[in-house]
């Protein structure tokens, strides 16, 4: 079941998922000057069964002017630079990452993809937050948000994270642990 809204926004923080539950949609968005091809789904879908899940449909972008660039290749390094600074979209394809049953990994980039990925998450999905470059994480609890179903409506839990203007970015699960942070700080409900 799809979550009704997007995960909470935290000032100076971004979020990502370690893996995506079946039923998750990833919009096929293209960078400026390009648009989705006219045939094919407007999104990729995490689909499969308990033993194996994968992304169904492939996103393809074509030039808004000339309608001939529909190749699906990994972007060149200079194209990659246009991605978000944390490269959140492709970080999780790590060799040591354990595959979760009923989940998909981060899909690989497609040519001329937009800089930000737009996901439609499903109930039970967890996303993890980290502070952007130049900001340090202060925690009073987990820096994560879970989409939950309550009384027939979906809601995201509030991540217990605040990002202060210091130097080191915090890490996602599985990466090196950041410096200890003080407890007892208020929640942040502001947006990026």
């Amino acid at each position: 079941e799809l979550c009704d809204d997007d995960p909470p926004k935290i000032t100076h923080a971004t979020f990502k998922a370690v893996a995506y539950k079946e039923g998750t949609m990833l919009n096929c968005e293209c960078k400026r000057g390009f648009r989705r091809i006219k045939s094919g789904s407007p999104y990729m879908l995490c689909t499969g069964n308990s033993s194996h899940s994968s992304w169904d449909n492939q996103c393809q972008c074509t030039s808004s002017a000339a309608r001939n660039t529909t190749k699906q290749v990994t972007p060149q390094p200079e194209e990659q630079k246009e991605r978000k600074t944390t490269e959140m979209q492709s970080q999780m394809q790590l060799a040591d990452q354990v595959s979760l049953p009923g989940h998909c990994r981060e899909p690989p980039p497609w040519e001329n993809e937009a800089t930000e990925r737009i996901y439609h998450f499903v109930v039970g999905q967890t996303v993890y937050y980290q502070c952007v470059q130049g900001y340090r994480a202060l925690h009073r609890g987990p820096a994560e948000s879970v989409c939950k179903m309550t009384h027939g409506k979906t809601r995201w839990t509030q991540p217990q994270l605040i990002c202060t203007g210091e130097t080191e970015p915090s890490q996602f699960p599985g990466e090196e642990e950041p410096q200890a942070s003080p407890d007892g700080l208020p929640e942040s409900e502001t947006s990026r």
């Epitope: 809204d5 968005e29 648009r35 045939s39 999104y43 449909n57 737009i118």
Partner: antibody, heavy 114, light 107 residues
């Protein structure tokens, strides 16, 4: 909670134009396409087109090119559809939709009558 | 344009029954099909996306199936509030198109 609030019913003369609105709330307006759908009694639902407010891209059903013009104002999180050279065939309920058709506005009834 | 045919314009059923609404596409649309419910005087409500995935808040008595050209919306244990018209839609290619609708009547 996601909401799409559409403007009220319109009674318009043949040959004129009408502009209806769809105000989005409860999600990031610039992240998702807004689509428009026409419904007339005794006819199939018809997809008119869609617009991406973030990049101001739009796609149109060939049938509605020249008839419908889609725009969006990101400052007010509002999408608009203008219908021109109206005839009785344009009398219908028009819906806006968002987030891959998951959410629909309440519809705007357009009646074209002399 | 891709044509979606809902061959049965009306279906009659009783509370507690199981009913299947079918939709046939004129060409392969993969699983890029959605189902909507529209009650009299209301906007369409999204039930199913990608042929078989339920939207949040949709009772689990609604299930979607199919791929390619043949799709089915099944309502098991029909309730009186299911009295409505049901539409399929393909979004595999522009222009997106809808089926003609199937009206469910409760005996």
């Amino acid at each position: 909670q996601v909401q799409l609030q559409q403007s009220g019913a319109e009674l318009v003369r043949p040959g004129t134009s009408v502009k209806m609105s769809c105000k989005a709330a409860g999600y990031t307006f610039t992240n998702y396409w807004i689509g428009w759908v026409k419904q007339r009694p005794g006819h199939d639902l018809e997809w008119i087109g869609d617009i991406h407010p973030g990049g101001d891209y739009s796609n149109y059903n060939e049938k509605f090119k020249g008839k419908a013009t889609l725009t969006a104002d990101t400052s007010s999180s509002t999408a608009y559809m203008n219908l021109s050279s109206l005839t009785s065939e344009d009398s219908a309920i028009y819906y806006c939709t968002s987030r891959n058709f998951a959410y629909w506005g309440q519809g705007t009834l357009v009646t074209v009558s002399a | 344009d891709i044509l979606l045919t809902q061959s049965q314009k009306f279906m009659s059923t009783s509370v507690g029954d199981r009913v299947s609404v079918t939709c046939k596409a004129s060409q392969n649309v993969g699983t890029n099909v959605a189902w909507y419910q529209q009650k009299p005087g209301q906007s369409p409500k999204a039930l199913i996306y990608s042929a078989s995935y339920r939207y949040s808040g949709v009772p689990d008595r609604f299930t979607g199936s199919g791929s390619g050209t043949d799709f089915t919306l099944t309502i098991s244990n029909v309730q009186s509030e299911d009295l409505a018209e049901y539409f399929c839609q393909q979004y595999n290619s522009y222009p997106y198109t809808f089926g003609g609708g199937t009206k469910l009547e409760i005996k």
